[in-house]
Interface confidence: medium
């Protein structure tokens, strides 16, 4: 069974998938469609790297531009370095500016909804 066929079988269970499962899926050539991606738990999507999302979505990564103002894409963008987002070649904006440090202050983030940044 190839990645695409496997994805079809598990698609209906993915809404509640944890980050670890999404990371594993990104290595299996599944080409997750955007409709499914948009239904994933925001907290599961946030830790994914740009490279992992690109692998997870396959051709559908090109559709991220259309969803950049919607959750979970919007929140995921806010967590990525702008440099990394630029590598997607989609013109996504809103990432962490170059030279900033990201502090993983869970409580701060839970209250404000955004990561805590320290300027250069």
């Amino acid at each position: 069974m190839n990645g695409s066929e496997y994805f079809v079988k598990i698609q209906s269970f993915l809404g509640g998938a944890p980050t670890e499962d999404l990371k594993a899926l990104s290595q299996q050539n599944v080409s997750m469609d955007l409709a499914t991606f948009m239904k994933l738990r925001t907290d599961a999507v946030l830790p994914l790297t740009v490279a992992e999302v690109q692998k997870l979505l396959g051709p559908h990564v090109e559709g991220l531009k259309a969803e950049e103002r919607h959750r979970p894409v919007r929140d995921w963008i806010l967590r990525q370095r702008q440099d990394d987002l630029d590598t997607l070649g989609l013109g996504l904006q809103g990432g962490i500016p170059n030279g900033y440090l990201v502090l993983d202050l869970s409580m701060q983030e839970a209250l404000s909804g955004t990561p805590c940044l320290l300027g250069p």
């Epitope: 990645g3 695409s4 066929e5 079809v8 050539n29 080409s31 469609d33 409709a35 396959g58 051709p59 559908h60 090109e62 559709g63 531009k65 259309a66 630029d86 590598t87 997607l88 070649g89 989609l90 013109g91």
Partner: antibody, heavy 120, light 107 residues
Framework: EVQLVQSGAEVKKPGASVKVSCKAS????????MHWVRQAPGQGLEWMGN????????NYNEKFKNRVTITVDKSASTAYMELSSLRSEDTAVYYC?????????????WGQGTLVTVSS | DIVMTQTPLSLSVTPGQPASISCKAS??????IAWYQQKPGQSPQALIY???YRYSGVPDRFSGSGSGTDFTLKISRVEAEDVGVYYC?????????FGGGTKVEIK
Amino acid sequence: EVQLVQSGAEVKKPGASVKVSCKASGYTFTSYWMHWVRQAPGQGLEWMGNVNPSNGGSNYNEKFKNRVTITVDKSASTAYMELSSLRSEDTAVYYCAPHYIGSRPGFAYWGQGTLVTVSS
Amino acid sequence: DIVMTQTPLSLSVTPGQPASISCKASQNVGTNIAWYQQKPGQSPQALIYSASYRYSGVPDRFSGSGSGTDFTLKISRVEAEDVGVYYCQQYNSYPLTFGGGTKVEIK
């Protein structure tokens, strides 16, 4: 208005290489991936590959993987498709087409096509 | 690779009559399908995306339907300007693949 202007027709000998250019205007070149599709005379459409104009990353159809190279010149908003070791079956019209422009998947815009004739 | 099989190969239609083109994918592609029209000597033109949504400027006599593996393009009332070859295309996974095409002619 989105415009894709391709280079002119080429006649090549078997074994040679050809490089077709595609100059884009009317949209942000680095925000949409560029794809190449070919069509042999009287035949259907065949996807060759694409390129991320931001970092030059590409995906290729396995059928062409060792013979095709897709590149970009960001400063000139131009994409290139080079096909090597040409054979008579490569005689075709080659099209460039960006994907997902205007947030809609699919190829909404196409270049005018470049006819490449391979003949001894 | 996902194989897209189009039927029929050609279609001869009386103006004003409906036409229907079928496209079957060799595996589930969700609704990640587009349809194109190609008139003689021209580049393809996009008609439908996401299986059922018309691109702007496409006449409403064109409609698309289907999901999974079976898709249909319908022309409710064929006009003389609709002659050409119609292609389905999946963008669900690499490599992107096209159907073999259906030639529509006017009787």
